[in-house]
């Protein structure tokens, strides 16, 4: 009795983070013995799609011509060979950006910061959100991922950095998201250039507690100024 069929490999081109309206192709690669490929989407009736293999039969293509909210989510694929179905692939998380208007990203007290001092990056969204992501250009993964502890909706999240070193210099953007689907992100914020001067090669710092703030009423500034902060967001390093 042969062992279980090896699991296929699942990936997306041009990538797994796709802007609304753009096309994306999901590939599932199995073995040359594959007769059929199946793609399942979490929380969707299975199978989400089936495809015959492309020659030489070791992979199949699943095309999404125009990315929308419905396609965002977590996928796995399988293939069927003469001896049965394979193990599921590792999951592919397909994320859509452009689901919400872009947040604004600020550096306080200034984007020009001296090494050894503190700076806070502030990401503010137009509508209340419960997840904020801060990314640095050319970094492989989000630097920081703030999520509300209790589903509380916030208009902003703070990303403190202290003490700042040369490592922190660079271009940042942030995204916001709702808890009901973390596969749907806002447009990216405009870029923020953080410039660190007088750089000393300090050890890599650990961030301090993150803070979120609720929006004020309509007769107050549209983004809160001087609201009492409360730590409703939990920090995740990725």
């Amino acid at each position: 009795q042969a062992g279980p069929l090896p699991k296929p490999t699942l990936w997306a081109e041009p990538g797994s983070v796709i802007s609304w309206g753009n096309s994306v192709t999901i590939w599932c690669q199995g073995t040359l013995e594959a007769r059929e490929y199946r793609l399942d989407k979490e929380e969707s009736p299975a199978p989400w799609d089936r495809q015959n293999p492309l020659e030489p039969k070791n992979k199949a293509r699943f095309s999404i011509p125009s990315m929308t909210e419905d396609y965002a989510g977590r996928y796995r694929c399988y293939y069927r060979s003469p001896v049965g179905w394979s193990q599921p692939s590792d999951p592919l998380e397909l994320v859509m950006t452009g689901a919400y208007s872009k947040p604004t990203l600020s550096a306080l007290p200034s984007p020009l910061v001296t090494s050894g001092k503190s700076v806070t990056l502030l990401c503010q969204s137009r509508s209340p959100m419960d997840t904020f992501l801060l990314i640095k250009e050319r970094a492989a993964h989000p630097l920081l991922h703030l999520r509300s502890e209790h589903g509380a909706q916030q208009h902003q999240a703070e990303f403190p950095m202290s003490p700042v070193t040369s490592v922190h210099g660079g271009t940042y953007r942030c995204f916001s998201s709702h808890g009901f689907s973390h596969y749907l992100l806002s447009h990216p914020s405009d870029p923020l250039e953080l410039i660190v001067s007088g750089s000393l090669e300090d050890p890599r710092p650990s961030p301090t507690r993150s803070v979120s703030t609720a929006a004020g009423p309509e007769d107050q500034p549209l983004m809160p100024t001087g609201s009492v902060p409360h730590s409703g967001l939990r920090r995740h390093w990725e």
């Epitope: 604004t104 509508s127 749907l184 703030t213 107050q220 500034p221 001087g226």
Partner: antibody
Framework: QVQLVQSGAEVKKPGASVKVSCKAS????????IDWVKQPPGKGLEWIGY????????SYNQKFKGRVTMTVDKSTSTVYMELSSLRSEDTAVYYC??????????WGQGTTVTVSS | DIVMTQSPDSLAVSLGERATINCKSS????????????LAWYQQKPGQPPKLLIY???TRESGVPDRFAGSGSGTDFTLTISSLQAEDVAVYYC?????????FGQGTKLEIK
């Protein structure tokens, strides 16, 4: 590309109501606020209010409260603004506009509403 | 409500020359939470809807020529067109988004001298 396409011109009698539509395309409709702005002939811009298609949340300028109603049909990506008890000073071009961050990055082409007896 | 006042009401500038439009708010538009000014500028040509030029007082919208520049802070703001082109003939509006109701300036009509 983002587009906001509004319904055609309307001529109404004083006291009547008008319902203007704004059909959105080219972006994720639910996640962006849509506002309405009034521009009387040869005059400036006046904010009327907004609707958030995701949950139907609305907020109106106090000046229009009681006379304006904004609604959304997510199935057709369309928002509506109804203005009741029309008077001559409601004669204007009415624009829908997509909010970016309280400012407006895309505008409809405008709908002319003429109130005349 | 925050009152936005533009000056001048109309302006005639020669092609290639600098045009400057001012906008004054009845209260500060500078947020202490993020040190940003909640002010936008729009251009409106006859028979067309307004077009966003500048937001956060000085950030140019994508696709807007770099001859358009916004400056100022607090209550006093300026839109500058560094070298006027024929296609810049329009009415320009400032808008505050610091608090509801959102309000606009009365507009400045820019013409060719």
């Amino acid at each position: 590309q983002v587009q906001l396409v509004q319904s055609g011109a309307e001529v109404k009698k004083p006291g009547a109501s008008v319902k203007v539509s704004c059909k959105a395309s080219g972006y994720s409709f639910s996640g962006f606020y849509i506002d309405w702005v009034k521009q009387p002939p040869g005059k400036g811009l006046e904010w009327i209010g907004y609707i958030f298609p995701s949950n139907g949340e609305t907020s109106y300028n106090q000046k229009f409260k009681g006379r304006v109603t904004m609604t959304v049909d997510k199935s057709t990506s369309t928002v509506y603004m109804e203005l009741s008890s029309l008077r001559s000073e409601d004669t204007a071009v009415y624009y829908c506009a997509r909010q970016a961050f309280y400012y407006f990055d895309y505008w409809g082409q405008g709908t002319t509403v003429t109130v005349s007896s | 409500d925050i009152v936005m006042t533009q000056s001048p009401d109309s302006l005639a500038v020669s092609l290639g020359e600098r045009a400057t439009i001012n906008c004054k708010s009845s209260q500060s538009l500078l947020s202490s939470s993020n040190q940003k000014n909640y002010l936008a500028w729009y251009q409106q040509k006859p028979g067309q809807p307004p077009k966003l030029l500048i937001y956060w007082a000085s950030t140019r919208e994508s696709g807007v020529p770099d001859r358009f520049a916004g400056s100022g802070s607090g209550t006093d703001f300026t839109l500058t067109i560094s070298s006027l082109q024929a296609e810049d003939v329009a009415v320009y509006y400032c808008q505050q988004y610091y608090s509801y109701p959102l309000t606009f300036g009365q507009g400045t009509k820019l013409e060719i001298k």
